[in-house]
Protein backbone atom coordinates (compact mmCIF):
# COMPACT_ATOMS: atom_id res chain seq x y z
CA UNK A 1 0.00 0.00 0.00
CA UNK A 2 0.73 3.77 -0.02
CA UNK A 3 3.17 5.15 2.39
CA UNK A 4 1.33 8.86 3.67
CA UNK A 5 2.96 11.26 6.32
CA UNK A 6 -0.31 12.03 8.33
CA UNK A 7 1.58 14.59 10.71
CA UNK A 8 4.52 16.11 9.22
CA UNK A 9 7.83 16.43 10.24
CA UNK A 10 8.26 19.02 13.51
CA UNK A 11 11.48 19.76 14.28
CA UNK A 12 13.76 21.13 17.46
CA UNK A 13 17.46 22.21 17.99
CA UNK A 14 18.96 22.08 21.39
CA UNK A 15 21.35 24.52 19.33
CA UNK A 16 24.28 22.24 20.03
CA UNK A 17 24.33 19.21 18.92
CA UNK A 18 21.61 17.87 18.00
CA UNK A 19 18.46 18.76 15.86
CA UNK A 20 15.22 16.34 16.75
CA UNK A 21 12.58 15.76 14.19
CA UNK A 22 9.37 13.89 14.78
CA UNK A 23 6.84 13.14 12.72
CA UNK A 24 3.42 10.75 12.60
CA UNK A 25 2.41 8.44 9.50
CA UNK A 26 -1.17 7.00 8.48
CA UNK A 27 -0.68 3.49 9.76
CA UNK A 28 1.53 1.61 12.34
CA UNK A 29 5.10 1.91 10.43
CA UNK A 30 8.02 0.35 11.37
CA UNK A 31 10.02 3.62 11.03
CA UNK A 32 13.80 2.33 10.97
CA UNK A 33 12.90 -0.39 8.30
CA UNK A 34 11.17 1.54 5.73
CA UNK A 35 12.20 5.58 6.42
CA UNK A 36 14.91 7.41 5.97
CA UNK A 37 15.55 11.25 6.60
CA UNK A 38 17.97 12.77 4.45
CA UNK A 39 19.16 16.45 5.72
CA UNK A 40 22.04 18.96 4.05
CA UNK A 41 22.57 22.52 5.34
CA UNK A 42 22.32 24.77 2.65
CA UNK A 43 26.46 25.89 2.61
CA UNK A 44 28.50 25.45 -0.71
CA UNK A 45 30.36 21.41 -0.32
CA UNK A 46 28.00 20.44 1.75
CA UNK A 47 26.99 16.86 1.77
CA UNK A 48 24.11 14.55 2.07
CA UNK A 49 23.47 13.07 5.65
CA UNK A 50 21.19 10.55 6.31
CA UNK A 51 19.29 9.84 9.46
CA UNK A 52 17.61 6.15 10.22
CA UNK A 53 14.45 7.29 12.27
CA UNK A 54 12.52 4.85 15.58
CA UNK A 55 9.67 4.86 16.75
CA UNK A 56 8.20 6.93 19.38
CA UNK A 57 4.87 5.21 19.01
CA UNK A 58 3.36 2.61 16.79
CA UNK A 59 3.18 5.26 14.01
CA UNK A 60 5.06 8.11 15.23
CA UNK A 61 8.99 8.35 14.14
CA UNK A 62 11.74 10.23 15.62
CA UNK A 63 15.05 10.99 14.15
CA UNK A 64 18.02 12.51 15.87
CA UNK A 65 20.58 14.00 13.75
CA UNK A 66 23.94 15.26 15.03
CA UNK A 67 24.49 18.94 14.11
CA UNK A 68 28.17 21.12 14.28
CA UNK A 69 27.68 23.69 17.05
CA UNK A 70 24.93 25.76 15.73
CA UNK A 71 24.65 29.61 14.51
CA UNK A 72 21.73 31.47 12.98
CA UNK A 73 22.27 31.44 9.10
CA UNK A 74 22.22 27.44 9.37
CA UNK A 75 19.24 26.25 7.15
CA UNK A 76 19.02 22.64 6.62
CA UNK A 77 17.19 20.93 3.74
CA UNK A 78 15.44 17.93 4.65
CA UNK A 79 13.71 15.16 2.93
CA UNK A 80 11.84 11.96 4.00
CA UNK A 81 11.99 9.09 2.10
CA UNK A 82 9.91 5.80 1.93
CA UNK A 83 12.59 3.85 -0.72
CA UNK A 84 12.49 5.90 -3.86
CA UNK A 85 9.17 7.81 -3.05
CA UNK A 86 9.70 10.82 -1.46
CA UNK A 87 7.28 11.70 0.98
CA UNK A 88 7.83 15.21 2.15
CA UNK A 89 10.24 17.94 1.55
CA UNK A 90 10.94 20.77 3.77
CA UNK A 91 13.70 23.38 5.19
CA UNK A 92 14.82 23.78 8.82
CA UNK A 93 16.47 26.62 10.57
CA UNK A 94 17.56 25.65 13.87
CA UNK A 95 17.80 29.25 15.60
CA UNK A 96 14.65 29.62 14.76
CA UNK A 97 13.11 25.81 16.26
CA UNK A 98 15.29 26.09 19.92
CA UNK A 99 14.54 23.03 22.48
CA UNK A 100 17.00 23.55 25.16
CA UNK A 101 18.81 21.06 26.92
CA UNK A 102 17.24 20.27 30.00
CA UNK A 103 19.01 21.71 33.38
CA UNK A 104 21.04 18.91 35.19
CA UNK A 105 22.00 18.15 39.13
CA UNK A 106 19.20 19.33 40.51
CA UNK A 107 19.86 19.41 44.77
CA UNK A 108 18.20 21.10 47.33
CA UNK A 109 20.54 22.13 50.22
CA UNK A 110 19.53 23.87 53.88
CA UNK A 111 20.71 27.45 53.74
CA UNK A 112 20.94 30.38 56.00
CA UNK A 113 18.35 31.97 57.68
CA UNK A 114 15.33 29.06 56.89
CA UNK A 115 15.76 28.77 53.27
CA UNK A 116 16.55 26.02 51.00
CA UNK A 117 18.98 26.67 48.15
CA UNK A 118 18.00 24.81 45.11
CA UNK A 119 20.91 24.76 42.55
CA UNK A 120 20.59 23.20 39.37
CA UNK A 121 23.32 23.63 36.43
CA UNK A 122 23.47 24.96 33.15
CA UNK A 123 23.10 22.38 30.81
CA UNK A 124 25.25 24.66 27.95
CA UNK A 125 29.15 25.02 28.51
CA UNK A 126 30.42 28.47 28.86
CA UNK A 127 31.53 29.27 24.96
CA UNK A 128 27.90 28.67 23.55
CA UNK A 129 25.69 31.26 22.66
CA UNK A 130 22.83 29.83 24.74
CA UNK A 131 24.74 29.49 28.06
CA UNK A 132 23.82 33.24 28.75
CA UNK A 133 20.58 33.21 27.67
CA UNK A 134 18.89 30.59 29.69
CA UNK A 135 15.94 31.31 32.16
CA UNK A 136 14.32 29.13 34.03
CA UNK A 137 11.07 27.47 35.73
CA UNK A 138 11.20 25.90 38.76
CA UNK A 139 7.88 24.08 40.00
CA UNK A 140 7.69 23.23 44.03
CA UNK A 141 5.01 20.58 44.84
CA UNK A 142 3.62 18.95 47.62
CA UNK A 143 3.66 15.22 47.50
CA UNK A 144 0.76 14.62 49.49
CA UNK A 145 -1.29 17.41 47.93
CA UNK A 146 -1.95 18.02 44.54
CA UNK A 147 -3.20 21.99 45.08
CA UNK A 148 0.27 22.52 47.35
CA UNK A 149 2.43 23.94 44.34
CA UNK A 150 4.25 26.62 43.41
CA UNK A 151 6.10 27.70 40.16
CA UNK A 152 9.02 30.46 40.48
CA UNK A 153 10.24 31.69 37.16
CA UNK A 154 14.37 32.44 37.05
CA UNK A 155 15.15 35.44 35.57
CA UNK A 156 18.77 36.22 36.70
CA UNK A 157 21.71 34.58 35.64
CA UNK A 158 22.78 32.09 38.38
CA UNK A 159 20.98 28.72 38.31
CA UNK A 160 20.16 29.11 41.60
CA UNK A 161 16.70 29.50 44.25
CA UNK A 162 16.32 30.35 47.41
CA UNK A 163 12.87 29.48 49.28
CA UNK A 164 12.35 30.27 52.43
CA UNK A 165 10.88 26.94 54.34
CA UNK A 166 8.15 28.49 55.99
CA UNK A 167 6.27 28.87 52.55
CA UNK A 168 6.41 25.26 52.69
CA UNK A 169 4.04 23.28 55.08
CA UNK A 170 5.73 22.07 57.98
CA UNK A 171 6.69 17.97 57.80
CA UNK A 172 5.55 17.82 54.75
CA UNK A 173 7.31 16.13 51.22
CA UNK A 174 7.91 18.29 48.59
CA UNK A 175 9.28 17.56 44.57
CA UNK A 176 11.14 20.58 42.84
CA UNK A 177 12.08 20.01 38.62
CA UNK A 178 13.14 22.67 36.68
CA UNK A 179 13.02 23.43 33.00
CA UNK A 180 14.50 26.11 30.87
CA UNK A 181 14.38 28.70 27.95
CA UNK A 182 16.09 31.29 26.02
CA UNK A 183 13.51 34.18 25.40
CA UNK A 184 15.89 36.21 22.56
CA UNK A 185 15.69 32.41 20.42
CA UNK A 186 11.89 32.64 21.10
CA UNK A 187 12.24 28.87 22.52
CA UNK A 188 10.01 26.03 23.15
CA UNK A 189 10.66 24.98 27.17
CA UNK A 190 13.27 22.52 27.74
CA UNK A 191 11.95 19.16 29.03
CA UNK A 192 11.57 18.73 33.19
CA UNK A 193 14.89 17.76 34.84
CA UNK A 194 14.44 14.57 37.12
CA UNK A 195 12.68 15.73 40.17
CA UNK A 196 14.53 15.98 43.83
CA UNK A 197 12.51 15.37 46.55
CA UNK A 198 13.30 16.45 50.43
CA UNK A 199 11.01 17.44 53.58
CA UNK A 200 10.76 20.62 54.48
CA UNK A 201 11.26 21.06 58.41
CA UNK A 202 10.09 24.09 59.39
CA UNK A 203 8.69 25.41 63.72
CA UNK A 204 7.82 28.92 63.55
CA UNK A 205 9.95 31.32 65.12
CA UNK A 206 8.71 31.32 68.90
CA UNK A 207 9.27 27.40 69.03
CA UNK A 208 13.42 29.26 69.64
CA UNK A 209 14.61 26.15 68.07
CA UNK A 210 18.40 27.32 66.08
CA UNK A 211 19.32 26.97 62.61
CA UNK A 212 21.20 24.16 63.42
CA UNK A 213 18.59 22.35 65.56
CA UNK A 214 16.15 22.63 62.55
CA UNK A 215 18.54 21.44 59.75
CA UNK A 216 19.52 18.62 62.23
CA UNK A 217 16.29 17.82 62.30
CA UNK A 218 15.11 17.96 58.73
CA UNK A 219 18.49 15.39 58.16
CA UNK A 220 17.21 12.86 60.07
CA UNK A 221 13.57 13.30 59.16
CA UNK A 222 15.26 13.05 55.73
CA UNK A 223 17.18 9.91 56.60
CA UNK A 224 14.05 7.84 57.84
CA UNK A 225 12.06 9.66 54.77
CA UNK A 226 14.25 8.13 52.90
CA UNK A 227 15.04 4.76 54.65
CA UNK A 228 10.88 4.32 54.37
CA UNK A 229 10.98 4.31 50.59
CA UNK A 230 13.67 2.10 50.10
CA UNK A 231 12.19 -0.43 52.14
CA UNK A 232 8.95 -0.01 50.73
CA UNK B 1 53.95 16.17 2.66
CA UNK B 2 51.27 17.21 0.43
CA UNK B 3 51.11 17.20 -3.32
CA UNK B 4 49.23 18.10 -5.97
CA UNK B 5 50.12 17.08 -10.00
CA UNK B 6 48.11 17.99 -12.26
CA UNK B 7 48.38 17.08 -15.94
CA UNK B 8 46.85 16.65 -19.09
CA UNK B 9 47.22 20.24 -20.64
CA UNK B 10 48.51 20.51 -24.12
CA UNK B 11 47.79 22.27 -28.07
CA UNK B 12 43.85 21.62 -28.46
CA UNK B 13 41.76 23.08 -31.87
CA UNK B 14 38.53 25.10 -30.97
CA UNK B 15 35.67 22.66 -30.39
CA UNK B 16 37.80 19.71 -29.32
CA UNK B 17 38.12 18.02 -25.87
CA UNK B 18 40.03 17.64 -23.50
CA UNK B 19 40.51 15.91 -19.99
CA UNK B 20 42.46 17.18 -17.13
CA UNK B 21 44.22 15.36 -13.97
CA UNK B 22 45.08 16.37 -10.73
CA UNK B 23 46.63 13.36 -8.59
CA UNK B 24 46.94 13.95 -4.75
CA UNK B 25 48.87 12.83 -1.73
CA UNK B 26 49.41 13.45 1.56
CA UNK B 27 45.70 13.75 2.87
CA UNK B 28 42.52 12.27 3.11
CA UNK B 29 41.77 13.52 0.19
CA UNK B 30 38.13 11.82 0.00
CA UNK B 31 36.98 14.32 3.19
CA UNK B 32 38.24 17.56 1.30
CA UNK B 33 36.03 19.45 -1.61
CA UNK B 34 38.39 20.08 -4.61
CA UNK B 35 38.44 23.07 -6.67
CA UNK B 36 39.91 24.02 -10.56
CA UNK B 37 41.11 27.63 -11.05
CA UNK B 38 42.48 28.85 -14.44
CA UNK B 39 45.23 31.85 -15.06
CA UNK B 40 44.63 33.07 -18.77
CA UNK B 41 48.18 34.67 -19.91
CA UNK B 42 48.86 38.05 -18.12
CA UNK B 43 45.30 38.16 -16.67
CA UNK B 44 43.82 37.31 -13.09
CA UNK B 45 42.54 34.00 -11.60
CA UNK B 46 39.76 33.07 -12.53
CA UNK B 47 37.46 29.99 -10.31
CA UNK B 48 35.71 27.70 -12.25
CA UNK B 49 34.27 24.55 -10.00
CA UNK B 50 33.99 22.84 -6.69
CA UNK B 51 33.22 19.39 -6.51
CA UNK B 52 32.33 18.02 -2.50
CA UNK B 53 34.57 15.18 -0.76
CA UNK B 54 32.23 12.29 -1.80
CA UNK B 55 31.58 13.77 -5.70
CA UNK B 56 28.01 14.48 -4.63
CA UNK B 57 27.82 18.16 -4.89
CA UNK B 58 29.67 20.14 -8.11
CA UNK B 59 29.33 23.67 -8.87
CA UNK B 60 30.47 25.48 -11.41
CA UNK B 61 30.90 29.11 -12.81
CA UNK B 62 28.73 30.80 -15.66
CA UNK B 63 31.60 30.53 -17.94
CA UNK B 64 32.24 26.56 -18.27
CA UNK B 65 28.74 25.58 -17.20
CA UNK B 66 27.36 22.99 -19.80
CA UNK B 67 30.87 22.56 -21.13
CA UNK B 68 33.20 21.70 -18.25
CA UNK B 69 32.38 18.33 -15.45
CA UNK B 70 34.24 18.33 -12.59
CA UNK B 71 34.76 14.91 -11.40
CA UNK B 72 36.75 12.80 -9.04
CA UNK B 73 37.54 9.25 -8.30
CA UNK B 74 38.46 9.01 -4.49
CA UNK B 75 40.03 4.81 -4.80
CA UNK B 76 42.41 6.71 -7.06
CA UNK B 77 42.95 10.14 -5.01
CA UNK B 78 42.37 11.82 -8.76
CA UNK B 79 40.55 14.41 -9.70
CA UNK B 80 39.02 15.58 -12.96
CA UNK B 81 38.34 18.16 -15.20
CA UNK B 82 36.45 17.35 -18.28
CA UNK B 83 36.36 20.45 -20.97
CA UNK B 84 34.57 19.93 -24.13
CA UNK B 85 33.28 22.56 -26.82
CA UNK B 86 36.76 24.23 -26.14
CA UNK B 87 36.99 27.62 -27.23
CA UNK B 88 40.07 30.10 -28.03
CA UNK B 89 39.37 32.26 -24.49
CA UNK B 90 39.78 28.87 -22.49
CA UNK B 91 43.59 28.99 -22.68
CA UNK B 92 45.06 29.18 -19.36
CA UNK B 93 47.14 27.66 -16.99
CA UNK B 94 44.67 25.21 -15.04
CA UNK B 95 45.72 24.98 -11.35
CA UNK B 96 44.33 22.25 -8.81
CA UNK B 97 43.45 23.29 -5.42
CA UNK B 98 42.53 21.82 -1.90
CA UNK B 99 39.19 23.23 -0.66
CA UNK B 100 37.37 23.04 2.48
CA UNK B 101 36.89 19.80 4.84
CA UNK B 102 33.24 18.40 3.92
CA UNK B 103 33.12 15.38 5.85
CA UNK B 104 31.76 17.33 8.90
CA UNK B 105 28.37 18.35 9.00
CA UNK B 106 29.10 22.55 7.88
CA UNK B 107 32.00 22.51 6.17
CA UNK B 108 35.49 23.52 7.58
CA UNK B 109 36.72 25.77 5.37
CA UNK B 110 40.23 27.12 5.49
CA UNK B 111 40.56 28.69 1.99
CA UNK B 112 42.44 26.90 -1.12
CA UNK B 113 45.29 25.90 1.38
CA UNK B 114 47.60 23.54 -0.75
CA UNK B 115 47.65 24.22 -5.16
CA UNK B 116 48.99 22.22 -7.70
CA UNK B 117 51.96 23.41 -10.26
CA UNK B 118 49.28 23.97 -13.38
CA UNK B 119 48.80 22.36 -16.60
CA UNK B 120 48.63 24.52 -19.91
CA UNK B 121 45.60 24.64 -22.15
CA UNK B 122 46.18 25.77 -25.53
CA UNK B 123 43.42 26.42 -27.44
CA UNK B 124 44.16 27.29 -30.76
CA UNK B 125 43.54 26.62 -34.82
CA UNK C 1 27.81 36.27 -8.54
CA UNK C 2 29.24 37.71 -6.06
CA UNK C 3 31.54 41.01 -7.20
CA UNK C 4 35.03 41.44 -5.98
CA UNK C 5 36.80 44.92 -6.35
CA UNK C 6 40.36 44.92 -5.05
CA UNK C 7 42.03 48.56 -4.53
CA UNK C 8 44.51 49.83 -5.31
CA UNK C 9 45.60 47.63 -8.41
CA UNK C 10 49.61 48.21 -8.27
CA UNK C 11 51.36 49.41 -5.23
CA UNK C 12 54.91 50.87 -4.39
CA UNK C 13 55.97 50.11 -1.17
CA UNK C 14 59.81 51.07 0.32
CA UNK C 15 60.94 48.09 2.25
CA UNK C 16 59.97 48.21 6.11
CA UNK C 17 57.00 50.18 5.57
CA UNK C 18 53.33 48.82 6.06
CA UNK C 19 51.33 47.74 2.66
CA UNK C 20 47.80 47.91 2.59
CA UNK C 21 45.47 46.46 0.15
CA UNK C 22 41.59 46.44 0.34
CA UNK C 23 38.60 44.06 -0.82
CA UNK C 24 35.30 44.83 -0.93
CA UNK C 25 32.53 42.41 -2.30
CA UNK C 26 29.07 43.15 -3.64
CA UNK C 27 27.35 40.85 -0.60
CA UNK C 28 28.39 40.56 2.74
CA UNK C 29 30.45 37.00 3.42
CA UNK C 30 30.06 36.92 6.81
CA UNK C 31 27.88 33.71 7.48
CA UNK C 32 28.32 34.02 11.35
CA UNK C 33 30.15 36.27 13.68
CA UNK C 34 33.81 35.03 13.37
CA UNK C 35 32.95 33.24 10.06
CA UNK C 36 34.00 36.04 7.04
CA UNK C 37 34.98 33.79 3.90
CA UNK C 38 37.58 36.03 2.81
CA UNK C 39 40.60 34.87 1.54
CA UNK C 40 43.78 36.61 0.58
CA UNK C 41 46.33 34.94 -1.32
CA UNK C 42 49.39 35.64 -3.10
CA UNK C 43 51.31 35.00 -6.50
CA UNK C 44 54.85 35.36 -7.53
CA UNK C 45 55.89 35.20 -11.47
CA UNK C 46 56.16 31.81 -12.58
CA UNK C 47 54.90 30.28 -9.61
CA UNK C 48 51.39 28.87 -7.85
CA UNK C 49 49.50 31.10 -5.96
CA UNK C 50 49.40 30.31 -2.38
CA UNK C 51 47.10 31.23 0.72
CA UNK C 52 47.99 34.11 3.20
CA UNK C 53 44.72 34.85 5.01
CA UNK C 54 41.78 32.76 5.32
CA UNK C 55 38.30 33.57 7.15
CA UNK C 56 39.38 37.24 6.70
CA UNK C 57 41.82 37.10 9.54
CA UNK C 58 42.96 33.73 9.88
CA UNK C 59 47.41 32.91 8.75
CA UNK C 60 47.24 29.96 6.70
CA UNK C 61 49.90 27.34 8.37
CA UNK C 62 53.39 28.83 7.81
CA UNK C 63 53.23 32.68 6.98
CA UNK C 64 54.92 34.99 8.69
CA UNK C 65 52.68 37.29 11.18
CA UNK C 66 53.66 40.45 9.19
CA UNK C 67 50.66 39.68 6.63
CA UNK C 68 47.48 40.26 8.41
CA UNK C 69 43.78 40.23 7.59
CA UNK C 70 40.85 42.41 9.20
CA UNK C 71 37.26 43.30 8.16
CA UNK C 72 33.31 42.02 7.82
CA UNK C 73 30.91 41.67 5.92
CA UNK C 74 31.58 43.14 2.60
CA UNK C 75 35.14 45.33 3.51
CA UNK C 76 38.44 43.85 4.25
CA UNK C 77 42.14 44.71 4.14
CA UNK C 78 45.22 42.84 3.98
CA UNK C 79 48.17 44.75 5.66
CA UNK C 80 51.92 44.03 5.00
CA UNK C 81 54.25 45.18 7.70
CA UNK C 82 57.81 45.88 7.46
CA UNK C 83 57.68 44.85 3.30
CA UNK C 84 60.33 43.26 2.24
CA UNK C 85 61.84 42.44 -1.32
CA UNK C 86 60.50 38.82 -0.94
CA UNK C 87 56.96 40.20 -0.90
CA UNK C 88 56.68 41.59 -4.63
CA UNK C 89 53.83 39.76 -6.14
CA UNK C 90 50.14 39.86 -7.50
CA UNK C 91 47.89 39.98 -4.43
CA UNK C 92 44.33 38.71 -5.11
CA UNK C 93 41.24 38.09 -2.25
CA UNK C 94 38.55 35.54 -2.90
CA UNK C 95 34.86 34.84 -1.25
CA UNK C 96 34.36 31.02 -0.79
CA UNK C 97 31.00 31.73 0.59
CA UNK C 98 28.55 31.61 -2.48
CA UNK C 99 28.63 30.01 -5.56
CA UNK C 100 30.12 31.02 -8.02
CA UNK C 101 33.08 31.42 -5.88
CA UNK C 102 35.49 34.77 -7.26
CA UNK C 103 39.25 36.44 -7.20
CA UNK C 104 39.30 39.97 -6.87
CA UNK C 105 41.90 41.33 -10.05
CA UNK C 106 44.47 41.60 -7.90
CA UNK C 107 46.91 44.08 -6.62
CA UNK C 108 50.60 43.92 -8.02
CA UNK C 109 52.93 44.94 -5.00
CA UNK C 110 56.47 46.05 -6.11
CA UNK C 111 59.27 47.21 -3.64
CA UNK C 112 60.79 49.79 -4.23
Known amino acids: GSVKVLHEPSCFSDYISTSVCQWKMDHPTNCSAELRLSYQLDFMGSENHTCVPENREDSVCVCSMPIDDAVEADVYQLDLWAGQQLLWSGSFQPSKHVKPRTPGNLTVHPNISHTWLLMWTNPYPTENHLHSELTYMVNVSNDNDPEDFKVYNVTYMGPTLRLAASTLKSGASYSARVRAWAQTYNSTWSDWSPSTTWLNYYEPWEQHLGLNDIFEAQKIEWHEHHHHHHHH | EVQLVESGGDLVKPGGSLRLSCVAS????????MTWVRQAPGKGLQWLSL????????YYADAVKGRFTISRDNAKNTLYLQMNSLRAEDTAVYYC??????????????????WGQGTLVTVSS | DIVMTQTPLSLSVSPGETASISCRSS???????????LDWYMQKPGQSPQGLIY???KRASGVSDRFSGSGSGADFTLKISRVEADDAGVYYC?????????FGQGTKLEIK
Open chain 2, 97 to 114: AVDRLTKTIRPQYYGLWH
Open chain 2, 26 to 33: GFPFRDYA
Open chain 2, 51 to 58: ISGSGGKT
Open chain 3, 27 to 37: QSLTYSIGYNY
Open chain 3, 55 to 57: LGS
Open chain 3, 94 to 102: MQGLHSPLG
